[in-house]
Interface confidence: medium
């Protein structure tokens, strides 16, 4: 690598993957082994992000960009650039303190991450139950009753509710 | 990159209503919920309520219940917070977030200011 | 109605352990998680579910949770933690609720 030779900053000429080591008169130095450096000018290199435990790795670091991880299966991920790894549970049921629960009553999850959600309410929409809701599936409305031929019947949710202590995530 | 984009700073009169966005990007936006937060000058974080982008269910801290509303558009991945009766204690940056029962991504916040 | 009560104040020199608690009738049942929050800054997550850190935070931050009271640790405390830390929590009908909040001073 040769030495910089702009006037300004010596340091601006060294490109990603490089740093410039004070050390060594601001010679643009390679980044030493898992570490990176994704923009021109460093003067250090970052440390590559290392997926271990429940993390795996996505893509594996290179002198200019960092490693990327994703979760083992069983796992989805959280968080920005998945910084977090957190259990799967199946549909019909919410992930709590004391592990995976079953949906209450008037609840549904359809994905195997996320919290048990509140059935639609039809009748907010002047709408009627066409199909009742179940740990898995929401509602689906039909017409409003009064859309409804005579002697059809409708069936419609009691309020949701949540035992006590059904925690979120 | 997952982002959330907020609307820039407002100055309101006491009464009136303000209407803030947050867009969405770089994730499923039905995926999770929509909360917003607001933190007064020199105070702490204050929960306002959240949106569910599937069917725009939608759930308030009582503090705010009746003068808050958070809406949803799936089409463009943004979420809205409008709040009525404006007073001077309203004054606080409003941050809208990411997640369920806890927030794993904050947008930059927006400044609302409130005076006569 | 879910309340989390912090002390207002903790105050420690560099390289000390500093221990910020939390507590509130509901933790033993549901999830503690903890903000860093520095002046002009969104929150952070340092810590989720009481105890897991997600990546890219450092090491010396963990959670401990025990019967109605949650604590977040900061052990080895730099001039960087300086900063609000804040509990939170939510109750069984997705309420969310912050603590008041514990401005962590570093001597």
């Known amino acids: 690598f040769e030495r910089t030779r702009s006037l300004q900053d010596p340091c601006s000429n060294c490109p990603a993957g490089t740093f410039c080591d004070n050390n060594r008169n601001q010679i643009c130095s390679p980044c030493p082994p898992n570490s990176f450096s994704s923009a021109g000018g460093q003067r250090t290199c970052d440390i590559c992000r290392q997926c271990k435990g429940v993390f795996r790795t996505r893509k594996e670091c290179s002198s200019t960009s960092n490693a990327e991880c994703d979760c083992t299966p069983g796992f989805h991920c959280l968080g920005a650039g998945c910084s977090m790894c957190e259990q799967d549970c199946k549909q019909g049921q919410e992930l709590t303190k004391k592990g995976c629960k079953d949906c209450c009553f008037g609840t549904f999850n359809d994905q195997k991450r996320g919290i048990c959600r509140p059935w639609t309410n039809c009748s907010l929409d002047g709408k009627s139950v066409l199909v009742n809701g179940t740990k898995e599936r929401d509602v689906v409305c039909g017409p409003s009753p009064a859309d409804l031929s005579p002697g059809a019947s409708s069936v419609t949710p009691p309020a949701p509710a949540r035992e006590p202590g059904h925690s979120p995530q | 990159q997952m982002q959330l984009v907020q609307s820039g700073a407002e100055v309101k009169k006491p009464g009136a209503s303000v209407k803030v966005s947050c867009k969405a990007s770089?994730?499923?936006?039905?995926?999770?919920?929509l909360h917003w937060v607001r933190q007064a000058p020199g105070q702490g974080l204050e929960w306002m309520g959240m949106v569910n982008p599937i069917g725009g269910y939608t759930n308030y801290s009582q503090t705010f219940q009746g003068r808050v509303t958070v809406t949803r558009d799936t089409a463009t991945s943004t979420a809205y917070m409008e709040l009525n009766s404006l007073r001077s204690e309203d004054t606080a940056v409003y941050f809208c977030?990411?997640?369920?029962?806890?927030?794993?991504?904050w947008g930059q916040g927006t400044l609302v200011t409130v005076s006569s | 109605l879910l309340v989390l009560t912090q002390s207002p104040s903790v105050s420690v020199s560099p390289g000390q352990t500093a221990r910020i608690t939390c507590s509130g009738d509901?933790?033993?049942?549901?999830?503690a998680y903890w903000y860093q929050q520095k002046p002009g800054q969104a929150p952070v997550l340092v810590i989720y579910?009481?105890?897991e850190r997600p990546s890219g935070i450092p090491e010396r931050f963990s959670g401990s949770s025990s019967g109605t009271t949650v604590t977040l640790t900061i052990s080895g405390v730099q001039a960087a933690d300086e900063a609000d830390y804040y509990c939170q929590s939510a109750d069984s009908s997705d309420i969310v609720v912050f603590g008041g909040g514990t401005q962590l001073t570093v001597l």
């Open positions: 977030a990411r997640g369920f029962g806890f927030i794993d991504h």
């Open positions: 579910k009481d105890s």
């Open positions: 509901a933790l033993p049942k549901q999830y």
């Open positions: 770089g994730y499923t936006f039905t995926n999770y919920y």
